[in-house]
């Protein structure tokens, strides 16, 4: 019996520009003889409906149709037909199909590959056109993919050290598509500093599919109104 197993859940997520390995494991009742078996990898785009061959391995012949594509022959001996693609691009997301032939048997498996780009985040203070004691803080997230993103604002006071989500005076603009296909978005928080306690810490919290944990940027309200911190970068997807 010949069987192929792909990534559990049927989806793999990889960071943009990464050297991705798309998993495909072969299960066969006998030891594999790589000179008498064949592996073909196919890719089907999300944006145009055509399936194309990415890589093929037959006996002593192997060919990469996509630049840099490789299946390791020595790993293949132990049943690992995983495909390695260097420098994965956003447009290469889609369905990947691993087809294995051990004559006369044939087996195949598919996996969805999602390519994600992590947002960069920064805090800006905009006082232009604002009334006295009024400040507008902007949290800019840029270069992320896919488009879905969640930006929230939180505050911590000395009285209430646990973060409280702010829902009033928050405006998050529309996502803007960049020329390279990634997205940007800005969220604004309007504050009346005269009504807030000095020492209050405000955070812009960005959640995105590419991030293991949220990206947090904070500033502290001081007697001199504000003190912007550097973005606290948390773990990016890897």
């Amino acid at each position: 019996d010949l069987k192929v197993e792909m990534m559990a859940g049927g989806t793999q997520i990889t960071p943009l520009n990464d050297n991705v390995t798309i998993f495909c494991n072969i299960f066969y009742s006998q030891p594999l003889n790589i000179t008498s078996m064949g592996i073909t990898w196919f890719w089907k785009s999300l944006t145009f409906d055509k399936e194309v061959k990415v890589f093929e391995f037959f006996g002593d012949h192997q060919e990469a149709f996509r630049p840099g594509a490789i299946v390791s022959p020595w790993r293949l001996k132990s049943g690992d037909a995983s495909l390695r693609l260097p420098g994965i691009q956003l447009e290469e997301a889609g369905e990947y199909r691993c087809e294995v032939v051990v004559t006369p048997l044939k087996a195949q498996g598919t996996v969805q590959l999602e390519v994600v780009a992590s947002p960069a985040s920064r805090l800006l203070l905009d006082q232009v056109g604002m009334k006295e004691n009024e400040d507008k803080y902007m949290c800019e997230s840029s270069g992320f993919y896919p488009e879905a993103i969640n930006i929230t604002w939180e505050k911590q006071t000395q009285k209430f050290p646990h973060p409280i989500e702010i829902s009033e005076d928050v405006i998050t603009g529309p996502t803007i598509k960049n020329m390279d296909g990634t997205f940007n978005v800005t969220s604004c928080l309007k504050l009346n500093s005269s009504q807030e306690d000095p020492g209050t810490v405000y955070q812009c919290v960005v959640r995105h599919a590419s991030l293991h944990t949220p990206l947090r940027s904070n500033f502290t309200l001081t007697a001199a109104r504000h003190s912007l911190s550097e973005t606290e970068k948390t773990d990016n997807f890897s």
């Epitope: 520009n17 785009s45 055509k50 990415v54 260097p86």
Partner: antibody, heavy 119, light 108 residues
Framework: EVQLQQSGAELVRPGASVKLSCTAS????????IHWVNQRPEQGLEWIGR????????IYASKFQGRATITTDTSSNTAYMHLSSLTSGDTAVYYC????????????WGQGTTLTVSS | EIVLTQSPDFLSASPGEKVTMTCRAT?????MHWYQQKPGSSPKPWIY???NLASGVPARFSGSGSGTSYSLTITRVEAEDAATYYC???????????FGAGTKLELK
Amino acid sequence: EVQLQQSGAELVRPGASVKLSCTASGFNIKNTFIHWVNQRPEQGLEWIGRIDPANGNTIYASKFQGRATITTDTSSNTAYMHLSSLTSGDTAVYYCARTYGGTNYFDYWGQGTTLTVSS
Amino acid sequence: EIVLTQSPDFLSASPGEKVTMTCRATSSLYSMHWYQQKPGSSPKPWIYATFNLASGVPARFSGSGSGTSYSLTITRVEAEDAATYYCQQWSTNPPKLTFGAGTKLELK
């Protein structure tokens, strides 16, 4: 072996049209995008447009929109570029090149066709 | 519309020297491709997706960069590296492919 073989040099009059060809071997053009790029004497590379031979969809650089037409004949594994209303400014080497899948990276190029527009 | 600006236009180096050429974009990009072209020949694929060397490219070449700034570096330049190097990107919004004007590398 993957190859893109282009048609021979052309000498044409201003105002005329020309059709350049690019025949692929070693792969099926339907699995790729075929692009056309030109290079004027002593100048850099300039993208003209691309075609998806699987469905005939084309995209052109705004400069060549309406003047360049890219087509394919999948039965002969050949791509064509028709360029009309030629001027001396179109004198250049024209390359066909392929990109594979979603890479947007030219992994194979033709040898180039020299087009001379002169009266 | 994204414009790619390569610098310098012209580079003169002695064998064994380290050289770096840059490609700057007017808008942030997520990757860059590079090609080598010698007089009378078609361009050759050289570096794919910022960092990855094309098949047959010597290991003395490397690519780096992110956002709006990308570079190609040759650690110890050799006579056969004399050529013009072009950067290239693809934008999806609107769909368009762009080349830089090229950096010509000459050996002393």
